[in-house]
């Protein structure tokens, strides 16, 4: 008799996920030699311990601590860039500008980055079939724990000046929701963090509106200046010529607003 | 090879402060976390917390908040600890730990006596 | 915070005898689970982490195994120079907690 399972209303945990989870690891250990220490079959063994055998509507960040400690990693705190809902131009960025880092540059968001988790209740399998979705389901699931718990911690690491990378196209181009607005916002440190520049990424070529006037960007800034950090905008109108400009500074046209 | 040494034995007034050091060497200190614990004469091991030198960050056992406050300065990497309002009590033996960022105590200092008497 | 009960307190044992000493944890803590020896008047050493794995230069007459909440420690073939207090340590939450200690002599 088959046993029941639950059945959740987002994707099951994503196909070979401890195969991939260890794999990564152990490429980026050796590409970054400040982390070859990292003994990565410990760290699959406390990211697997976090939420095997565990409901998974009933994680803990306390869960994930044995996987925080064994992942530590200390990036340049000047050099940090968040992101809200335009990941890709993020990465790209960094891959380009090296001295800067993403969260998923770092070892515990390398290894995270695009998968889906969870375990059963009081059984040692990982559930392929469905996961808990965060709005309908559970915002306590393993996925949504984890990346709170790692947004935090970065957020909490940060300093002097902190960049984000925010969405134009978007209708709430910062969103109190986001992971940006809702967990890192909070968590950067007013006593080391001298600034948020956020950079607005316009969507349409021909789109040439100050979005630093957005209403949702005032609201962020209202949020930042009451945690007395100073707060600035940049419209970034031409993403594609700004990647460009990043890779060659010394280009003519780099000189002009992009 | 890691080596954590630390500062000589002290013997301080109920009431006094003290502050003890623990030089890192063999590795990249601001990598990695210190551990400090405290072991009073003939009894057990009681983890007080830890610093992680690059970014400062801390985590104390909720016993030991307002008596430990925990530092570190990166640039002759070396940890401190200093305890406050001492009393009988704090007399014992403090040992840092580290390196590794692991789960367990790897290497040790080799433990600094504290002694509280009028 | 995660209470570790080691047992017994204290043992004595023969020269060549193998002794188990226990450690339980309150909650389960996976396998976060090393144990130390303490020899008088010096400093803890590692001798296991992560439940059963030996530390770099421990002999192998040093085992441990266990996880979730049950853990044991064994020495077979006792010498005399295993003559210490062995303490248990979980690494699964903050505060990290210890045992309260085995000490061990020989009869």
């Known amino acids: 008799v088959p046993r029941w399972r639950q059945q959740w209303s987002g994707p099951g945990t994503t196909k070979r996920f401890p195969e991939t989870v260890l794999a990564r690891c152990v490429k980026y250990t050796e590409i970054h030699p400040e982390m070859r220490h990292v003994d990565c079959q410990s760290v699959w063994d406390a990211f697997k311990g976090a939420f095997i055998s565990k409901h998974p509507c009933n994680i803990t960040e306390e869960d994930y601590q044995p996987l925080m400690k064994l992942g530590t990693q200390t990036v340049p705190c000047n050099k940090i860039l968040l992101w809200s809902r335009i990941k890709d131009l993020a990465h790209q960025f960094t891959q380009v500008q090296r001295d800067m880092f993403t969260l998923e540059d770092t070892l515990l968001g390398y290894l995270a980055d695009d998968l889906t988790w969870c375990g059963e209740f009081n059984t040692s399998k990982i559930n392929y079939q469905s996961c808990p979705d965060w709005r309908k389901d559970c915002s306590n699931n393993p996925v949504s724990v984890f990346w709170k718990t790692v947004s935090r911690r970065f957020a909490e690491a940060a300093c002097d000046v902190v960049h984000v990378m925010l969405n134009g196209s978007r209708s709430k181009i910062f969103d109190k929701n986001s992971t940006f607005g809702s967990v890192e916002v909070h968590n950067l440190q007013p006593e080391k963090v001298q600034t948020l520049e956020a950079w607005v990424i316009h969507g349409g070529r021909e789109d040439s509106r100050d979005l630093c006037q957005d209403p949702t960007i005032k609201e962020l800034e209202s949020i930042i200046s009451k945690r007395n950090i100073q707060f600035s905008c940049k419209n970034i109108y031409r993403p594609d010529k700004f990647l460009q400009c990043v890779k060659n500074p010394e280009d003519s046209s780099c000189t002009s607003e992009i | 090879q890691v080596q954590l040494q630390q500062s000589g034995a002290e013997l301080v007034k109920p009431g006094a402060s003290v502050k003890i050091s623990c030089k890192a060497s063999g590795y990249t200190f601001s990598n990695y976390w210190i551990e400090w614990v405290k072991q009073r004469p003939g009894l057990g091991l009681e983890w007080i917390g830890d610093?992680?030198?690059?970014?400062?960050?801390?985590n104390y056992n909720e016993k030991f908040k307002g008596k430990a406050t925990f530092t570190a300065d990166t640039s002759s990497n070396t940890a401190y600890m200093q305890l406050s309002s001492l009393t009988s009590e704090d007399s014992a033996v403090y040992y840092c730990?580290?390196?590794?960022?692991?789960?367990?105590?790897?290497?040790w200092g080799q433990g600094t006596l504290v002694t509280v008497s009028a | 915070d995660i209470q570790m009960n080691q047992s017994p307190s204290s043992l004595s044992a023969s020269l060549g005898d193998t002794i188990t000493i226990t450690c339980h944890a309150s909650?389960?803590?996976?396998?976060?689970l090393s144990w130390y020896q303490q020899k008088p008047g010096n400093i803890p050493k590692l001798l296991i982490y992560k439940a059963s794995n030996l530390h770099t230069g421990v002999p192998s007459r040093f085992s441990g195994s266990g996880s979730g909440t049950g853990f044991t420690l064994t020495i077979s073939s006792l010498q005399p120079e295993d003559i210490a207090t062995y303490y248990c340590?979980?690494?699964?939450?903050?505060?990290?907690?210890f045992g309260g200690g085995t000490k061990l002599e020989i009869k």
């Open positions: 730990a580290g390196y590794g960022n692991y789960l367990w105590f790897t290497y």
């Open positions: 610093i992680l030198p690059g970014s400062g960050t801390t």
């Open positions: 909650q389960n803590i996976n396998v976060w």
């Open positions: 340590q979980q690494g699964q939450s903050y505060p990290y907690t």
